[in-house]
Interface confidence: low
Amino acid sequence: RRGAPAEDQDCGRLPDFIAKLTNNTHQHVFDDLSGSVSLSWVGDSTGVILVLTTFQVPLVIVSFGQSKLYRSEDYGKNFKDITNLINNTFIRTEFGMAIGPENSGKVILTAEVSGGSRGGRVFRSSDFAKNFVQTDLPFHPLTQMMYSPQNSDYLLALSTENGLWVSKNFGEKWEEIHKAVCLAKWGPNNIIFFTTHVNGSCKADLGALELWRTSDLGKTFKTIGVKIYSFGLGGRFLFASVMADKDTTRRIHVSTDQGDTWSMAQLPSVGQEQFYSILAANEDMVFMHVDEPGDTGFGTIFTSDDRGIVYSKSLDRHLYTTTGGETDFTNVTSLRGVYITSTLSEDNSIQSMITFDQGGRWEHLRKPENSKCDATAKNKNECSLHIHASYSISQKLNVPMAPLSEPNAVGIVIAHGSVGDAISVMVPDVYISDDGGYSWAKMLEGPHYYTILDSGGIIVAIEHSNRPINVIKFSTDEGQCWQSYVFTQEPIYFTGLASEPGARSMNISIWGFTESFITRQWVSYTVDFKDILERNCEEDDYTTWLAHSTDPGDYKDGCILGYKEQFLRLRKSSVCQNGRDYVVAKQPSVCPCSLEDFLCDFGYFRPENASECVEQPELKGHELEFCLYGKEEHLTTNGYRKIPGDKCQGGMNPAREVKDLKKKCTSNFLNPTKQNSKSNS
């Protein structure tokens, strides 16, 4: 579909691009000696960036620290030192900058306070960091302030003494609503879920915690779970891992009504050394990783039904090192249904796998055209692409960035990888897919930092090097041709690329420092590509593209989860602006149903390489554990259940005799008599 990338030669050079970019390159030198810099975007399409620099000297008795705060309101072209707005206070970098949701314009900075103080101190802004108000807290925060997704005036925080504190007026006043809290999270509709320890401490009571809920910011409470190990929220599901009565194992329970009623998930139980992890969740379903016993570094991915109760095995030997460890699981946001992850083979080699149908089937990534198989390949003509993600980064391989995709840059996926039978420890190259992962091409030789601008209209890259750099590369044709631009005559030690989240901007900021014998000076260069894409895209610049198309002759071509989508996409040859207001235009159409649109319901399974669901053997010797809403149920099924999010209509309807699965529920979790309500009066 596409040739190997070319850099400068053999490519349609853009006229006068050097002059255009030179006129739109803005340098800012930061007048401080800080050791670290953190950057946050405030709001969407506001152009406001906050930069916090910190300088810390650990002395024998105390540590001396200094912070500086800078603000830009033009996407990083110019910065103003606003440290005076926070009274030149040292800001605790471990709390970061707490930026409010959506376009609230809210920012909270947590200050360092002296040892004997009664509580912490924060600086609050609600006008995109134009002004800050200093507020002394009645507690020492343990975590960053958490905004309610529904109302940015509502905040929660945990204190160092495990108190749960809530503010209803953007941190001006605080109230401790509960003590002995281990973990707290905002749910929908300003609900707060939290676990509490009853006897000793969070660590000692693990597996004996209680799960509580408050729907009125701490006026009243309801205990919605006991014997809790941990809990999590994903999509519309609330999950809790609950200790079994008889042993030290635990099981996942799920609720779709904020904890009023619970069902036992049909997932394996796990022991003390194992873990569950929600890999991804949406309003329809959840991907759940269940760790294998022993220190194997892998487990199994299961995908749920629409209730979050019945799970199908999706992928074996899924790489996931330890609790809170590394997994390469990646949601490819540029195409519906696509996920990439890694598996650990018997020989301990790591291989990449991709699914195009939300975990229904996994396969190897297709070998890029015109690429050679590396030393890991047994057969030099047959191999596949393997993607470097979090695990490779954690192993300090020469991988500066994880895979990148953006919802508004349809079909584009950029990642470091190698071509062979498994991930290679050799220096990787950068590969690109323009069709959501079906086909790949080498984009750049060697490791690079990369980012997407103007909804895919421009891709920018900088070589990963331990030497100072002064060249930025860019492509206006989805990575086929590359131009190089020298953005400064004085090379800098590069530390990062920054562009506004959402990939709609045409500005990119290159961060780094210059170092002389005694000083290090932070510097940023912001390059605006607006004059490269000088005209607005017009009708002829776009073409229609059928996503997931693999067999154009087939009437079901492009059907994934019961429907196909046709997109309007920018032609590679068009050099024009999608613009900040660009919204992906797509036309969905429904597909007829087939057995692929159904998963096997409780008590049924699909034998290897079969499409029909067959009833499970009677599982003699132990009862099926099926607990729906915490009490014995009469479950009826025809063995099939529509895959979550599947929109197929007509076609094949797997009608068969409806069975009555009268099974004893073996879970006494949340026996209704155990539920109680409390009032905080």
Epitope: C537, D581, V583, A585
Partner: antibody
Framework: QVQLVQSGAEVKKPGSSVKVSCKAS????????ISWVRQAPGQGLEWMGG????????SYAQKFQGRVTITADESTSTAYMELSSLRSEDTAVYYC???????????????????WGQGTTVTVSS | DIQMTQSPSSLSASVGDRVTITCRAS??????LNWYQQKPGKAPKLLIY???SLQSGVPSRFSGSGSGTDFTLTISSLQPEDFATYYC?????????FGGGTKVEIK
């Protein structure tokens, strides 16, 4: 240069429906958003809804939801607006208009409408 | 829906005059504002898009400014063919909404 030519004037009884057509000529039709805007006698302009023909799906103002249907036929480069349950206050000139830029913007009509039909007068009277 | 308020609703001016029409949005609409000119019995004509960008073919005596909630259409030197009704239109929120119009008449 694109031109939009609308169907002729209509006189309708209350409770009935009217369907107005808008044919594009002299340029491409499919990918631009086509809006329908009405203007009651002596009054201002009111956006009713729009469609991007290539995608078929229409977007409607809440006020007209359930009463208006906007469709497009790519093969004849024609857009249609049907308004049902007519009442006297629906008496107006109905215009079709083309969004001035390609619809990166889905069903939000950001950059204004640069090509307009000549207008179709619909009179609702018993 | 976002309300658009134009003022004045009508004005009288002479050829060569500088004319200013204002439009206020009920909430911030960034720069998603367009201006149209309409003559009796005719369809509207797009003059300005994105608050300040002049539509192709429109004379340079027309200019637009503003962002957020307050916007202005200025005709630097009124010509005989400029006597018409002018409408502003916001396109930040759905549905797009128009102002009530400003009628520019001959003094």
């Amino acid at each position: 240069q694109v031109q939009l030519v609308q169907s002729g004037a209509e006189v309708k009884k209350p409770g009935s429906s009217v369907k107005v057509s808008c044919k594009a000529s002299g340029g491409t039709f499919s990918s631009y958003a086509i809006s329908w805007v009405r203007q009651a006698p002596g009054q201002g302009l009111e956006w009713m809804g729009g469609i991007i023909p290539i995608f078929g799906t229409a977007s409607y103002a809440q006020k007209f939801q359930g009463r208006v249907t906007i469709t497009a036929d790519e093969s004849t480069s024609t857009a249609y607006m049907e308004l049902s349950s007519l009442r006297s206050e629906d008496t107006a000139v109905y215009y079709c208009a083309r969004e001035s830029r390609i619809p990166g913007s889905g069903y939000y009509y950001y950059y204004g409408m640069d090509v307009w039909g000549q207008g179709t007068t619909v009179t609702v009277s018993s | 829906d976002i309300q658009m308020t134009q003022s004045p609703s009508s004005l009288s001016a002479s050829v060569g005059d500088r004319v200013t029409i204002t439009c206020r949005a009920s909430q911030s609409i960034s720069s998603y504002l367009n201006w149209y000119q309409q003559k009796p019995g005719k369809a509207p004509k797009l003059l300005i898009y994105s608050a300040s960008s002049l539509q192709s073919g429109v004379p340079s005596r027309f200019s637009g400014s503003g962002s957020g909630t307050d916007f202005t259409l200025t005709i630097s030197s009124l010509q005989p063919e400029d006597f018409a009704t002018y409408y502003c239109q916001q396109t930040d929120g759905k549905p797009p909404t128009f102002g009530g119009g400003t009628k520019v008449e001959i003094k």
